[in-house]
Interface confidence: low
């Protein structure tokens, strides 16, 4: 299905609006520090060129690959060396090495200012004055801060962003209408970004096979009525889509995602009974809806797994003939029967099954050797079940904020070398598992909790990879994708850690804390908690609780004082002295 001009092909498939939006996202994800105006100029130049190719596919340079065209365009940026340093060296390379080089320089934690939300009236004026620029700016700001954001999904977010402003800027109470919608988009966007980051990490760090195994398990849970061949086809297509997006091939990715949605909707009878509503929606909503669709009901008459995978005399023959296919079938059959398991647990079970077959199919009596393989699954299933039960009990007892604090202490003691902002961000997100998943019935808790924790721990892994400081984090992150959570759970207090020198400045607070939102104030307190643990890793829960209670009372008292700044200065010194005494610092 070769086209004379790839750029013309994608322009025609996607349409001008989506083409321009996707090129902007691609450029902003690569050159994260470039000003908005520079990117718009580059996108306009690429778009004009694409139009000449649509008019005449044989025109000069129209036969070049998208990587060549886009890379050449990015390398025209005048300030590349000053702004990006060694990334400029990518421009000396030829494709495909040049694109790989750009990919390697994507920064998960770019040094960009926090996005501050202007007043509602200011935003509405900007929206009405120039809607197109306003929406482009949204794409640009999200893409540069989230360089792995799933591009076709970002188009869906932008559509909802536009709808929110269109509706709310006409409302009587603009703020009441708009702000909750923007909060929802922000929270959903962060979650979407983190989920996609795990997919890209899975592909890039652990290979296509790892991603395909994940996809077989997840799609089999979601579409338990679909045949194995159907699931395999969907997995192959989905892998192509995500490989493209994670590789910066956003036009191909968006195009192939649209094709996949079309295929799923045309074949929904053989895939799932839950797709009807999704398939009636416009393209962007349809793709999003399919990706989030609930699990179909399990077929009523599924036979025991043991027949084909334990009792059959042909197990080793089937395994030897096509190992990946046989293991894929095992994963499919197990997953469609277990929507109550997390995907990572299903992958651990498949791994255990495979290890057993490797050992047993070479034994004198294979059947005797693997006959009890399902018994080996029991402890693997019970471990996450018990962990979730204990943590949900703790969450229900403490509430979200204090549960986050418990996790902050736990993780700081495990990996105290990790930077304080990273520990705060990751522990806060780990703590959100409580409100997200503990409300669910038993049958939905594990897939909710453990697969969410995989996403959050991946955030820790990608942030740590940028500046590695802990061998323990590196070990848990790199050795096994599906065992990351058990690896971190198993870490005890790091006895090799030398406590941080006490620095009173770290615990000096000012009146500005009083004007912060509740969330920002929590983050300040949690930052102090992490620093306390880094100074005194052996502090007991009771000691830390006492200091944190004193700290909360101190902030409350000084925020009510007439002379707030003096209160923070004087009472702060007393608090530091009392805390040092309480913790023996």
């Amino acid at each position: 299905d070769a086209h004379k001009s790839e750029v013309a092909h994608r322009f025609k498939d996607l349409g001008e609006e989506n083409f321009k939006a996707l090129v902007l996202i691609a450029f902003a994800q690569y050159l994260q520090q470039c000003p908005f105006e520079d990117h718009v100029k580059l996108v306009n130049e690429v778009t004009e060129f694409a139009k000449t190719c649509v008019a005449d596919e044989s025109a000069e340079n129209c036969d070049k690959s998208l990587h060549t065209l886009f890379g050449d365009k990015l390398c025209t940026v005048a300030t590349l060396r000053e702004t990006y340093g060694e990334m400029a060296d990518c421009c000396a390379k030829q494709e495909p090495e040049r694109n790989e080089c750009f990919l390697q320089h994507k920064d998960d934690n770019p040094n960009l200012p926090r996005l501050v939300r202007p007043e509602v009236d200011v935003m509405c004026t900007a929206f009405h004055d120039n809607e197109e620029t306003f929406l482009k700016k949204y794409l640009y700001e999200i893409a540069r801060r989230h360089p792995y954001f799933y591009a076709p999904e970002l188009l869906f977010f932008a559509k909802r962003y536009k709808a929110a402003f269109t509706e709310c800027c006409q409302a009587a109470d603009k703020a009441a209408c708009l702000l909750p919608k923007l909060d929802e988009l922000r929270d959903e966007g962060k979650a979407s970004s983190a989920k996609q980051r795990l997919k890209c990490a899975s592909l890039q760090k652990f290979g296509e096979r790892a991603f395909k195994a994940w996809a077989v398990a997840r799609l089999s849970q979601r579409f338990p009525k679909a045949e194995f061949a159907e699931v395999s086809k969907l997995v192959t297509d989905l892998t192509k889509v995500h490989t493209e997006c994670c590789h910066g091939d956003l036009l191909e990715c968006a195009d192939d995602r649209a094709d996949l949605a079309k295929y799923i909707c045309e074949n929904q009878d053989s895939i799932s009974s839950k797709l009807k509503e999704c398939c009636e929606k416009p393209l962007l909503e349809k793709s999003h809806c399919i990706a989030e669709v609930e699990n179909d009901e399990m077929p009523a008459d599924l036979p025991s797994l043991a027949a084909d995978f334990v009792e059959s005399k042909d197990v080793c023959k089937n395994y030897a003939e096509a190992k990946d296919v046989f293991l894929g079938m095992f994963l499919y059959e197990y997953a469609r029967r277990h929507p109550d398991y997390s995907v990572v647990l299903l992958l651990r079970l498949a791994k255990t099954y495979e290890t057993t077959l490797e050992k047993c199919c070479a034994a004198a009596d294979p059947h005797e050797c693997y006959a009890k393989v399902f018994d080996e699954f029991k402890p693997l299933v019970e471990e996450p079940q018990n962990l979730i039960k204990q943590n949900c009990e703790l969450f229900e007892q403490l509430g979200e904020y204090k549960f986050q604090n418990a996790l902050l202490v736990r993780y700081t003691k495990k990996v105290p070398q990790v930077s304080t902002p990273t520990l705060v961000e990751v522990s806060r997100n780990l703590g959100k598992v409580g409100s997200k998943c503990c409300k669910h019935p038993e049958a939905k808790r594990m897939p909710c909790a453990e697969d969410y924790l995989s996403v959050v721990l991946n955030q820790l892994c990608v942030l740590h990879e940028k500046t590695p400081v802990s061998d323990r984090v590196t070990k848990c992150c790199t050795e096994s994708l599906v065992n990351r959570r058990p690896c971190f759970s198993a870490l005890e207090v790091d006895e090799t850690y030398v406590p941080k020198e006490f620095n009173a400045e770290t615990f000096t607070f000012h009146a500005d804390i009083c004007t912060l939102s509740e969330k920002e104030r929590q983050i300040k307190k949690q930052t102090a908690l992490v620093e306390l643990v880094k100074h005194k890793p052996k502090a007991t829960k009771e000691q830390l609780k006492a200091v944190m209670d004193d700290f909360a009372a101190f902030v409350e008292k000084c925020c009510k004082a007439d002379d707030k700044e003096t209160c923070f200065a004087e009472e702060g010194k007393k608090l530091v002295a009392a805390s040092q005494a309480a913790l023996g610092l």
């Epitope: 652990f206 290979g207 990946d324 651990r348 791994k351 290890t355 070479a362 790199t478 096994s480 065992n483």
Partner: nanobody
């Protein structure tokens, strides 16, 4: 059955070099990680170097700049080039290959650095 066999160990003078090889016989589904660990007498086994399927490498601080890990995907082989060897590098070196959630270990090869 999967078996890992290490080779290339031996006695070498301080400052010398050795190249360890590890070959996997049998088929392992979806290798994600290959690594070298070592264990000196009376000490814990420790990670020396590891390499993921995409070629990303990780080294223990004590060997950075001296040791290089590499792999040959087509042959299920992993190598460790050890230069500027020191007495404290003396240990049994083990090869480790992992996939979805478990690992396979070799029997180990002795490396002795002594004058």
């Amino acid at each position: 059955q999967v078996q890992l066999v290490e080779s290339g160990g031996g006695l070498v003078q301080p400052g010398g070099s050795l190249r360890l090889s590890c070959s996997a016989s049998g088929s392992i589904w979806g290798i994600y990680h290959m690594g070298w660990y070592r264990q000196a007498p009376g000490k814990q086994r420790e990670l020396v170097a590891s390499i993921t399927v995409d070629g990303s490498t990780h080294y223990a601080d004590t060997v950075k700049g001296r040791f290089t890990i590499s792999r040959d995907n087509s042959k299920n082989m992993v190598y460790l080039q050890m230069n500027s060897l020191r007495a404290e590098d003396t240990a049994v070196y083990y090869c480790d290959i992992r996939n979805v959630g478990g690992d396979y270990w070799g029997q180990g090869t002795q490396v002795t650095v002594s004058s």
